[in-house]
């Protein structure tokens, strides 16, 4: 009988045993146990990864596969030798014994062995293919790595070169900036010197202009005087001719001509034929007391007596009651004509008041009151106004009914405070009210949010301080 059995030896190798009669044939075959299972990431017929494996792992795997192949090759060679040896022995026995059925058994064994060999060969072929596939992939990966490395090296070199270029450029620019700074400092210094020179020049020119203005004023006054003298001489000649006839009429004529020379206001000056704007001497009504006033002979037909002007902040308007009474400043510039003169004048006949305003943005506006007068000092020069027209607000910025005049030393306002002290300047304050054209003079860009500035509420609001103002009066019947 024959019996075919498969088992394991002590080291776990597969044994193929054939029992035939008293003869027992044992074959120890090599196995690929050193190859990893299909769960291992290294099995080549498993699903291939997208990302390449680590280079060191790939090399290690190649070494493992090579050792397995060598192992298998050695086993195959041993097996072949073993088969050849056994076949020889068997052939001798068959020939010696000439037993027919032994031949059949040997053929069966041979067939089995051939099948096993074929199976082993197929497995080895598979392993070889896997190794080849893995080797090819590793070569490709190595090539990719090499290319990538070369590319990176090139990029690094390019960047290094670029950095060097930029550093050179930066150094150049830094040098340029430093040079420019030096030039700039020199330029600034020269500009500063120029500015100082210009300032000196401007102040000189200002002095010259002021001197010329004084000369012009003097010339104007002289011109007026000359005109008067000419007029007087003509009249004197005429008087002398008349005097020859009658001495009594001559006296009357002289007195009349003397009266004609005095001017009560700028309307009188204008009517006399003096139509050039400038400073003229005016005489108080019913008095010989005189005051100098600026006459505006151009605005709206001329004949305007200027009673206030602000234009540059050159005159301090925080003055006493007495100063506001008699007047202060320069009639050709910033000034207050004087409350006493204006009160006396406006109580003689009906006058209109025109207030001309200018802001810092180049805008102009005016308020015209068709009836204006001041009470006497006894009533604190209280202001009286009627009939407002004009562009500086539909509502009067001088409180109605009119208020008494207040100064820093005469508090006649309606406030618990002293408006003149709070807002500065003398004015017809209420409590303290919507206007104060005698407030602090603020220059451009400092003229907003100034509650003690030159204020005309119904044109520019609470905190706006104006650039220039003029107050002028003229008889209503002019």
């Amino acid at each position: 009988y024959s019996n075919f059995r498969k088992s394991m030896d002590s080291v776990g190798r597969k044994q193929y045993q054939v029992q035939h009669g008293s003869c027992s044939y044992t074959f120890l075959l090599p196995e690929t146990d050193n190859c990893r299972s299909s769960s291992s990431p290294y099995v080549s017929n498993a699903v291939q990864r997208d990302a390449p494996l680590d280079y060191d792992d790939s090399v290690h795997r190649l070494q493992v596969l090579e050792s397995i192949m060598e192992n298998n090759t050695q086993w195959l060679m041993k097996l072949e030798n073993y088969i050849q040896d056994n076949m020889k022995k068997e052939m001798v026995e068959i020939q010696q014994n000439a037993v027919q059925n032994q031949t059949a058994v040997m053929i069966e064994i041979g067939t089995n062995l051939l099948n096993q060999t074929a199976e082993q060969t197929r497995k080895l072929t598979d392993v070889e293919a896997q190794v080849l596939n893995q080797t090819t992939r590793l070569e490709l990966q190595l090539l990719e790595h090499s290319l990538s490395t070369n590319k990176l090296e090139k990029q690094i070199l390019d960047q290094t070169s670029e950095i060097n270029k930029l550093q050179d450029k930066n150094s150049f620019l830094e040098k340029k900036v430093l040079d420019m700074e030096d030039k700039h400092i020199v330029q600034l210094q020269s500009i500063k010197e120029e500015k100082d020179q210009l300032q000196v020049l401007v102040s000189k020119q200002n002095s010259i202009i002021e001197e010329l203005e004084r000369q012009l004023v003097t010339a104007t006054v002289n011109n007026s005087a000359l005109q008067k003298q000419q007029h007087d001489l003509t009249e004197t000649v005429h008087s002398l001719l008349t005097m020859i006839a009658t001495s009594s009429s001559a006296k009357n004529s002289f007195a009349a001509k003397e009266e004609q020379i005095t001017f009560r206001d700028c309307a009188d000056v204008f009517r006399s034929g003096l139509t050039t704007s400038g400073i003229y001497t005016l005489t108080f009504p019913n008095s010989t007391e005189e005051t100098k006033a600026y006459c505006d002979m151009e605005t709206g037909g001329g004949g305007w007596t200027t009673i206030q002007r602000r234009e540059d902040g050159s005159v301090d308007f925080q003055r006493t009651w007495k100063e506001y009474k008699v007047g202060f400043g320069n009639p050709s510039g910033e000034h207050w004509l004087g409350n006493e003169f204006v009160s006396q004048l406006t109580n003689q006949q009906r006058y209109v008041l025109k207030i001309h305003l200018r802001d810092w943005e180049g805008n102009e506006a005016y308020s015209l009151y068709e009836h204006f007068y001041l009470s006497s000092e006894e009533f604190n020069y209280r202001i009286h106004l009627k009939g407002l027209t004009g562009t500086a607000g539909k509502i009067s910025s001088i409180s109605q009914p009119g208020n008494d005049f207040s100064t820093k030393d005469a508090d006649n306002d309606k406030c618990i405070c002293k408006c003149s002290q709070m807002l500065t300047g003398g004015w017809w304050f209420d409590a303290c009210g919507p206007s104060n054209l005698n407030g602090m003079y603020y220059p451009q860009r400092q003229n907003t949010n100034k509650f003690n500035g030159i204020k005309w509420y119904y044109w520019k609001g609470s905190g706006y301080s104006l650039k220039a103002t003029t107050m002028m009066i003229r008889p209503a019947d002019f």
Epitope: C415, I416, C417, K418, Q421, M422, A431, C432, G433, P434, N449, K450, F451, K455, Y457, K460, G461, S462, G463, Y464
Partner: antibody, heavy 121, light 107 residues
Amino acid sequence: QVQLVQSGAEVKKPGSSVKVSCKASGYSFTDYNMVWVRQAPGQCLEWMGYIDPYNGGTGYNQKFEGRVTITADESTSTAYMELSSLRSEDTAVYYCARTRDRYDVWYFDVWGQGTLVTVSS
Amino acid sequence: DIVMTQSPDSLAVSLGERATINCKASQDVYIAVAWYQQKPGQPPKLLIYWASTRDTGVPDRFSGSGSGTDFTLTISSLQAEDVAVYYCHQYSSYPPTFGCGTKVEIK
């Protein structure tokens, strides 16, 4: 009676803007200036600016210049204060208040109830 | 800006006793000073203006004085309802500024 009613509390992110309203009643809205004052936690009262509702004239504390805008709507008797580019230190109670005088920004006789503005990221 | 410095920061006074709060301006503000009372969770309330004038409805136990740079608010007889923070405020010069407050408590 004279009353100023302000809008409700606001929580804002840094860099954003807030607009607080103040509705006046019981008096002629255009007869008095309106001011805005703020009070940060543990800080002094700070005057921010004013508006004259009669002519829309405004004035601002230089500290807030460029960030604060005060407006008024005569038709609804409402004043508004908008503060932009908010920072955490703008967290405060914001008050509107009426000045006693139209012509001058002096003392403040009527105050709103206040609006808490919290600036937090 | 004009700085208004209040003193003391806090003040504890017995009921019926006098409480005095001082305020010093960094420059002359004439009499353009107001005083406000602020109770917790409420807006400030005007008490005094023009340094010494009581606003309508303010009890006469509150009085103000001073001019120039030194100002005082006096509560002649402290009442429980007077517990609050008191602020001085100058409006003489732009921008108007406030003191940082004096807390009045009952001892």
